[in-house]
């Protein structure tokens, strides 16, 4: 008799999830010599232990604590780049500007980027059929709790000037419900962070509006100012040129506004 299985509203665990996490860990430790000492089997065991045999709507930050310990890493606190709804450009930027870090440039972020996972209560099975959706099912699911945990810790670690890349093509350039708006903004430490600098990325080539005047950016400025952190904002009118100028800052066309 087949066992009844909970049907969730979200997609199931990414296929070959264990193999993917293990392979990513090995690759990361090969690329980053300072992480060569990491035992990837132990990392996978800790990752698995956070959600296997647990109800996928009852996951806590504490469940991920063993994984957090194994993911200990040096991140220059003044070189942190946060992002919201514009992940690809943020990652392209840090691939060029190698001394800056997004969360996905760390081991823990790299392991989980774009993956979905969940288990089932009282069985050691991974659920490849469906996983809880944050809105339709529950917020304390394995994926959401993981990203909330690492995002909170990443923001807590930041100091001096923190940069955030925001998508100027979206109706809400700053969205209070995004991970940046709901977690990272509130976990920047005012005693360590002097300024949050927003980079608003324009989508259209002919878009010359000052999106730093957008009401949602003003809302972000208000939230940040109330936390005793300074706020600044820059328009990135030409993201393609912006990246090109990060690669080749000496280029004569890079002295004008990007």
């Amino acid at each position: 008799v087949p066992r009844w299985r909970q049907q969730w509203s979200g997609p199931g665990t990414t296929k070959r999830f264990p193999e993917t996490v293990l392979a990513r860990c090995v690759k990361y430790t090969e690329i980053h010599p300072e992480m060569r000492h990491v035992d990837c089997q132990s990392v996978w065991d800790a990752f698995k232990g956070a959600f296997i045999s647990k109800h996928p709507c009852n996951i806590t930050e504490e469940d991920y604590q063993p994984l957090m310990k194994l993911g200990t890493q040096t991140v220059p606190c003044n070189k942190i780049l946060l992002w919201s709804r514009i992940k690809d450009l943020a990652h392209q930027f840090t691939q060029v500007q190698r001394d800056m870090f997004t969360l996905e440039d760390t081991l823990l972020g790299y392991l989980a980027d774009d993956l979905t996972w969940c288990g089932e209560f009282n069985t050691s099975k991974i659920n490849y059929q469906s996983c809880p959706d944050w809105r339709k099912d529950c917020s304390n699911n394995p994926v959401s709790v993981f990203w909330k945990t690492v995002s909170r810790r990443f923001a807590e670690a930041a100091c001096d000037v923190v940069h955030v890349m925001l998508n100027g093509s979206r109706s809400k350039i700053f969205d209070k419900n995004s991970t940046f708006g709901s977690v990272e903004v509130h976990n920047l430490q005012p005693e360590k962070v002097q300024t949050l600098e927003a980079w608003v990325i324009h989508g259209g080539r002919e878009d010359s509006r000052d999106l730093c005047q957008d009401p949602t950016i003003k809302e972000l400025e208000s939230i940040i100012s109330k936390r005793n952190i300074q706020f600044s904002c820059k328009n990135i009118y030409r993201p393609d040129k912006f990246l090109q100028c990060v690669k080749n800052p000496e280029d004569s066309s890079c002295t004008s506004e990007i």
């Epitope: 310990k69 200990t72 890493q73 040096t74 991140v75 810790r153 670690a157």
Partner: nanobody
Framework: EVQVLESGGGLVQPGDSLRLSCAAS????????MSWVRQAPGKGLEWVST????????DYADSVKGRFTISRDNSKNMLYLQMNSLRAEDTAVYYC??????????RGQGTLVTVSS
């Protein structure tokens, strides 16, 4: 600006004890969890222990549990690590850092602990 200064390291024999100290300044000490991390020669950063801002909650790496004790004196902005039953594998530069990790940017020079017979 967060500043820390570690001290108390040295050369000891296996089984001996050491007490590391960390003087912190530039921030409201009680507002921050504090951690000890270490880096063995030729190895990466390893988390050792964390203590909450109030000092009421502590956590340890399995490799040091039962041998090391983290503590703090909030009136003096000081963090401590009492290390007993030291082993050769505890040889490392020890850093104190603000926060609970896993992302650390240590500000001090660290203090070298060498365990050798």
């Amino acid at each position: 600006e967060v500043q820390v200064l570690e001290s108390g390291g040295g050369l000891v024999q296996p089984g001996d004890s050491l007490r590391l100290s960390c003087a912190a300044s530039g921030f409201t000490f009680t507002n921050f969890a504090m951690s000890w991390v270490r880096q063995a020669p030729g190895k990466g950063l390893e988390w050792v222990s964390t203590i909450s801002g109030s000092g009421g909650s502590t956590d340890y790496a399995d490799s040091v549990k039962g041998r090391f004790t983290i503590s703090r004196d909030n009136s003096k902005n000081m963090l401590y690590l009492q290390m007993n039953s030291l082993r050769a594998e505890d040889t490392a530069v020890y850093y104190c850092a603000d926060g609970r990790g896993p992302f650390f940017d240590y500000r001090g020079q660290g203090t070298l602990v060498t365990v050798s017979s």
